[in-house]
Interface confidence: low
């Protein structure tokens, strides 16, 4: 090579190249009429160079143009996060469509896809039990009232706990475990003053799951003086 | 620059840069006086080609010499894959020191450092509590038997469960749950055969947790007839 | 969310051997024990082996011991289940499981809250 060439030196960099997460909906906007379950996916460690990155949204290999996009966000670490949601039909999720997001970018060296589906496998109805304080808490001022959901199957549930009928707060469910069997179980433990449970106040443990009939059941927990 | 001067074009390669991560020690060997608990640290993606990776290991950043570093592994992708576990004392854990595994190379540009430590924050005992099988329950052959374990700081934590003294199999803990107060809370479930529960056995709920006076408590339930 | 792929089943005569790959997707693999599980016709899944997130620890099922090994590599996000010796009672849809890591010291593959899809394996002569 002539030595007036000016050939330049190679400077490589190591690529940040992004990732691309998908999440399914909520069991609860699965399993409510009323509600819009939708699938999420979510590019991160975009850069700020990057242009933006395109979304196309398949249901069965088959194209559907009805996601909605947000404008990308700048996250602490300088990088940015780009986030699509693709509503879906409720009966699309639940007889097992897969859900495929391709993300695509001048930046990427090829597009990114990730697909989701609910859990394959024959729907198993949770058995729900509600158990009281236990006795030796009574001496305290705050008792846990405890919904036990077992041999659900897949795992996708929602539990949620009312009082006298209006929505309750402070309660706090486990991730659902699996048993030796493949089913699962959950508990939900619902925190209340001695007070409210002593009155006699009426607690409902309320139960979504796909397996059940009408995809719900509840049951319902009260003081019995003399117990 | 002139037509034939021949520069060649950059061909960029992505290097394959080792990954390092610790590990803690295992709650119940930290709170058992004859166990010895360890921190670990694990260097992955090893070329085959690299020199053998250097663990030094530091406590509260004075330099220890007391690990057990094994031979490195090769693994199903043709890369290394290099463990150093650090014993460590008891004390030293609960009492919040800094472990610090430094591990370098002459394949590595830099040393690569992790270092871990007991979660801040003062320790709460558990309150523990165990609840018989749901009267509800009763009709199927196997009842589960719950053991509520609340309240406690930080989440490491151990529940077993015995049998008549003998360590029982079947049972599954869920991960702790952060309480809204800071505090976590776990349930164990314990499934046994409902002849079992009723022939009178006593099952005995077992938990190590730091905060505990000897770091250990128990709970034993059995059935009661005619309740 | 993550997912996870299983591959390398197949058809096999008894005595053969079957190594079935289980890739994970959608998460850091060293957050996870793996699992593997099988579902023979007409008959619950069943635990057949599992490995702690950083390969230290491994069960078997009595059935299997000695004849399975289970393995994993973070660096390539897949778990390993090499299958020697298989007998026709092995056959069955088998399927890989991700949960993750449990600091309690006695639980070697706790609570897996992840699954493939299965691949199946079937021993015949």
């Known amino acids: 090579v002539p030595r007036d060439c000016g050939c330049k030196p190679c400077i490589c960099t190591v690529p940040e190249v992004s990732s691309v997460f998908i999440f399914p909906p909520k069991p609860k906007d699965v399993l409510t009429i009323t509600l819009t379950p939708k699938v999420t996916c979510v590019v991160v460690d975009i850069s700020k160079d990057d242009p933006e990155v395109q979304f196309s949204w398949f249901v069965d290999d088959v194209e559907v143009h009805t996601a909605q996009t947000q404008p990308r966000e700048e996250q602490f670490n300088s990088t940015f996060r780009s986030v699509s949601e693709l509503p879906i039909m409720h009966q699309d999720w639940l007889n097992g469509k897969e859900f495929k997001c391709r993300v695509n970018s001048a930046a990427f060296p090829a597009p990114i896809e990730k697909t989701i589906s609910k859990t394959k496998g024959r729907p198993k109805a949770p058995q729900v039990y509600t158990i009281p304080p236990p006795k030796e808490q009574m001496a305290k001022d705050k008792v846990s009232l405890t919904c036990m959901i077992t041999d659900f199957f897949p795992e996708d549930i929602t539990v949620e706990w009312q009082w006298n009928g209006q929505p309750a707060e402070n309660y706090k469910n486990t991730q659902p475990i699996m048993n030796t069997n493949g089913s699962y179980f959950v508990y939900s433990k619902l925190n209340v003053q001695k007070s409210n449970w002593e009155a006699g106040n009426t607690f409902t443990c309320s139960v979504l799951h796909e397996g059940l009939h009408n995809h719900h059941t509840e049951k319902s927990l009260s003081h019995s003086p003399g117990k | 620059v002139p037509r034939d001067c021949g520069c060649k074009p950059c061909i960029c390669t992505v290097p394959e840069v080792s990954s390092v991560f610790i590990f803690p020690p295992k709650p119940k060997d930290v709170l058992t006086i004859t166990l010895t608990p360890k921190v670990t640290c694990v260097v992955v993606d090893i070329s085959k080609d690299d020199p053998e990776v250097q663990f030094s290991w530091f406590v509260d950043d004075v330099e220890v010499h007391t690990a057990q570093t094994q031979p490195r592994e090769e693994q199903f992708n043709s890369t290394f894959r290099s463990v150093s576990e650090l014993p460590i004392m008891h004390q030293d854990w609960l009492n919040g020191k800094e472990f610090k595994c430094r591990v370098n190379s002459a394949a590595f540009p830099a040393p690569i450092e992790k270092t871990i430590s007991k979660t801040k924050g003062r320790p709460k005992a558990p309150q523990v509590y165990t609840i018989p099988p749901p009267k509800e329950q009763m009709a199927k052959d196997k009842v589960s038997l719950t053991c509520m374990i609340t309240d406690f700081f930080p989440e490491d934590i151990t529940v077993e469960w015995q049998w008549n003294g003998q360590p029982a199999e079947n049972y599954k803990n869920t991960q702790p749950i952060m309480n809204t107060n800071g505090s976590y809370f776990v349930y164990s479930k314990l499934n046994v055969q409902k002849s079992n529960w009723e022939a009178g056995n006593t099952f005995t709920c077992s938990v190590l947790h730091e905060g505990l006076h000897n770091h250990h408590t128990e709970k034993s339930l059995s059935h009661s007839p005619g309740k | 969310q993550v997912q996870l792929v299983e591959s390398g089943g197949g058809l096999v005569q008894p005595g053969g051997s079957l190594r079935l790959s289980c890739v994970v997707s959608g998460g850091t693999m060293n957050a996870y024990a793996i699992g593997w599980f099988r579902q023979a016709p007409g008959k619950e899944r069943e635990a057949v082996s599992c490995i702690t997130s950083n390969s230290k620890y491994t069960n078997y099922a009595d059935s299997v011991k000695g004849r399975f090994t289970i393995s994993r590599d973070n660096a390539k996000s897949t778990a390993y289940l090499q299958m020697n010796s298989l007998e026709p009672e092995d056959t069955a849809v088998y399927y890989c499981?991700?949960?993750?890591?449990?600091?309690?010291?006695?639980?070697?593959?706790?609570?897996?809250?992840?699954w493939g899809q299965g691949t199946q394996v079937t021993v015949s002569s």
């Open positions: 499981a991700a949960a993750q890591f449990f600091n309690d010291g006695h639980q070697y593959c706790p609570n897996p809250n992840y």
